[in-house]
């Protein structure tokens, strides 16, 4: 008779990025008798849920269970059926719903009851859906990719699992670039983390880790770009917005109504004199980077060195992953590459940004307007967050590695979170046999 | 264990109004849903409201305009007023616990208060 | 608002029997369809959710199946503590709506 294969034992968990500007499924899968272990949940699946990010639904709520239904259908196709009555759904909403609870808490709290109940009505074993601090989005961020480099085992291995890999156990900074908001996460070395706010302790695996990481609310590329443009028409002597992070000849009309409906343009908002401006390129990388700038205020510090508008930021220290729109922008403008330099980088930004917007089009012709339009921007602020925000210097630059994925997972908080919701980071490094769940993080 | 415990039933005339309460215990409020559903005697069963965790509500279309649902965390109580009372409004009124977080299907139901309404 | 329909309102049985109650929805509802159980004088007890998902502590001889319109809870082996209302719910869209029920009586 033939040997039957064994069911294979594994577990699945599902977790929801609702981010300002899309909600993305990801699907883990991992060993049920390793779930100790690091470096054994893998991503097996993303869907990217087509339409915007949740918040957008506040005045639509009735049509957030249509659009959840494509990627939750999947989920249901691709984890067994016998497993779905254990596999834990978390859904976590970032800066997209932090901005909407900001506006109105009433109307951020029906949206997530919402999702609740959309979520609630699949045969998962969902856990509910919450808006995750800035801090926790740092914090889960560093988790996922240091889990994924291996840079919590205690076993030292003779090969390399991603190119830029130093093979030590000398954790990796994150920095992660959302469209509201932007987080920056790592073990300074020795130095005092001086506003407690920042400060972060965690023993993994039997190591202690004193973390600093801050989010930057309204700094993610989105919403510096509105920062940016509301800014900019204060200053604009008629309904014409020359703007130098736009391709020449590029156009578009602004409704002032959009411009202000954002808390974070709130500091830039004054009565105009018309309720729609014109925003015509004119692609001038310098004078996009100088118009970015005006954004961080630098003038303030109240520490012994700060990133920018007083917030304290210790020396960068060691290697940086930069992850999320940080590395999709730099993807797509072919900027990933470890061996571009950062004066590399600033001229092929100069170049791009002057291409006349049809050429651009032309060039691009699979990419859609909305998006395209913007990398100037993104690319320029970029660079400009990274260099004067993050202080990272020419020198410096060769330590940040853009990363979309580890071993097949992408880098950002979503592993992060699963793994610590499930209980799946001991406190102390697991013995032979598995510990009991009393001394996780 | 979860229960619910509803009260407040009772005979009323037409036109009339009650206030029915939901006492929970074994779970709270700010963790699932409650839901109200009738049942007239004899009859099928049919849903009225919900309040979800965060106190969003959501009605039957049919009743809206006399129902009102609401909860006091602290009580652990769920309430849901009734006006304008009908004949056809007599039915043993249940509360009912979200399976999940926020579901739209019940895996406890309290025991029933029963409403009468004749003149 | 959607109509669910059981179109058995009686149903003769005997133990061991295998029983399949239908439930038929007016629209799709997809898989958004749960089973009650209801004994004279008592509150609705859940069987089954998302169509044919058992809920926990159910006994297994329950088990629904179905999709879109036509759905169907089935007792393999019928017990006498088994006589009692079947109840089906849609939950694919507001206002949920239950079916009429079905009785299980002894022949």
């Known amino acids: 008779t033939q040997n039957k294969a064994l069911p294979e034992n594994v577990k699945y968990g599902i977790v929801l990025d609702a981010g300002s500007s899309h909600t993305s499924l990801y699907i883990y899968k991992w060993p049920a008798e390793k779930e100790n272990d690091t470096g054994v949940v893998h991503q097996v699946e993303e869907c990217r849920v087509k339409g915007p990010g949740i918040s957008k639904f506040v005045q639509k709520v009735n049509e957030i269970g249509i659009y959840l239904t494509d990627c939750m259908e999947r989920a249901r196709e691709v984890i067994p059926r016998s497993q779905h009555q254990e596999t834990p759904v978390y859904l976590g909403a970032t800066a997209g719903m932090r901005l909407l609870r900001m506006e109105s808490e009433e109307l951020a709290d029906r949206v997530l009851d919402v999702v609740e109940r959309s979520l609630s009505n699949y045969p998962f074993d969902f856990q509910g859906a919450r808006i995750i601090t800035g801090q926790e989005e740092g914090a889960y961020g560093w988790i996922t990719i240091n889990y994924l480099l291996g840079k919590f085992s205690q076993k030292t291995r003779w090969f390399s699992i991603v190119p830029y890999e130093t093979n030590n156990q000398e954790t990796f900074g994150a920095l992660d670039l959302g469209g509201a908001s932007t987080q920056v996460t790592f073990v300074p070395q020795n130095q005092t983390i001086e506003s407690p706010d920042n400060a972060l302790q965690f023993r993994l695996y039997g190591k202690d880790y004193n973390v600093y990481t801050h989010s930057f609310l309204c700094y993610g590329k989105d919403q510096a770009l509105w920062q940016k443009l509301a800014k900019d028409i204060q200053v604009a002597s008629n309904e014409i917005l020359r703007d130098p992070c736009f391709h020449p000849g590029y156009k578009k009309v602004v409704n002032v109504s959009d411009l202000y409906k954002t808390p974070c343009t709130k500091r830039f908002e004054m009565t105009l004199p018309f309720q729609q401006f014109e925003i015509q390129g004119i692609g001038n990388y310098q004078q996009c980077h100088q118009s970015i700038l005006e954004l961080f205020n630098t003038s303030y510090c109240p520490y012994s060195q700060c990133a920018f508008n007083g917030i304290f930021l210790p020396p960068l220290q060691g290697d940086f992953g930069a992850f999320s729109a940080f590395y999709f922008v730099m993807k797509f403008l072919n900027l990933t590459s470890e061996k571009v330099s950062q004066e590399k980088v600033t001229e092929m930004m100069k170049k791009f940004c002057a291409q006349p917007w049809e050429e651009i089009k032309t060039s691009y012709a699979g990419v859609k307007e909305k998006y395209l339009s913007e990398y100037c921007f993104s690319g320029t602020y970029i660079l400009s967050l990274l260099l004067q925000g993050y202080h990272f210097t020419a020198d410096s630059w060769e330590h940040i590695h853009f990363i979309g994925k580890i071993q097949g997972s992408d880098a950002g908080w979503t592993l992060g979170y699963m793994l610590n919701l499930t209980n799946m980071i001991p406190a102390e490094q697991p013995l032979s046999t598995p510990l009991s769940h009393s001394t996780y993080v | 264990q979860v229960q619910l415990v509803e009260s407040g039933g009772g005979v009323v005339q037409p036109g009339g109004s009650l206030r029915l309460s939901c006492v929970v215990s074994g779970f709270t409020l700010t963790n699932y849903g409650v839901h109200w559903v009738r049942q007239a005697p004899g009859k099928g069963l049919e849903w009225l409201a919900v309040?979800?965790?965060?106190?969003?509500?959501d009605y039957n279309a049919a009743f809206m305009s006399r129902l009102a649902i609401s909860k006091d965390n602290s009580k652990n109580t769920v309430y849901l007023e009734l006006n304008s009372l009908r004949l056809d409004d007599t039915a043993v009124y249940y509360c009912?616990?979200?399976?999940?977080?926020?579901?739209?299907?019940?895996?406890?139901w309290g025991q029933g208060t029963t409403v009468t309404v004749s003149s | 608002d959607i109509v669910m329909t059981q179109s058995q309102k009686f149903m003769s049985t005997s133990v061991g029997d295998r029983v399949s109650i239908t439930c038929k929805a007016s629209?799709?509802?997809?898989?958004?369809v749960a089973w009650y159980q209801q004994k004279p004088g008592q509150s609705p007890k859940l069987l089954i959710y998302?169509?044919?998902y058992r809920y926990s502590g159910v006994p297994d001889r329950f088990t629904g199946s179905g999709s879109g319109t036509d759905f169907t809870l089935t007792i393999s082996n019928m017990q006498s503590e088994d006589l009692a209302d079947y109840f089906c719910?849609?939950?694919?869209?507001?206002?949920?709506?239950f079916g009429g029920g079905t009785k299980l009586e002894i022949k």
């Open positions: 719910q849609q939950y694919n869209s507001y206002p949920l709506t």
């Open positions: 629209q799709n509802v997809g898989t958004n």
């Open positions: 009912a616990k979200t399976a999940v977080v926020a579901g739209d299907y019940f895996d406890y």
């Open positions: 998302s169509a044919s």
């Open positions: 309040i979800l965790r965060r106190g969003s509500t």
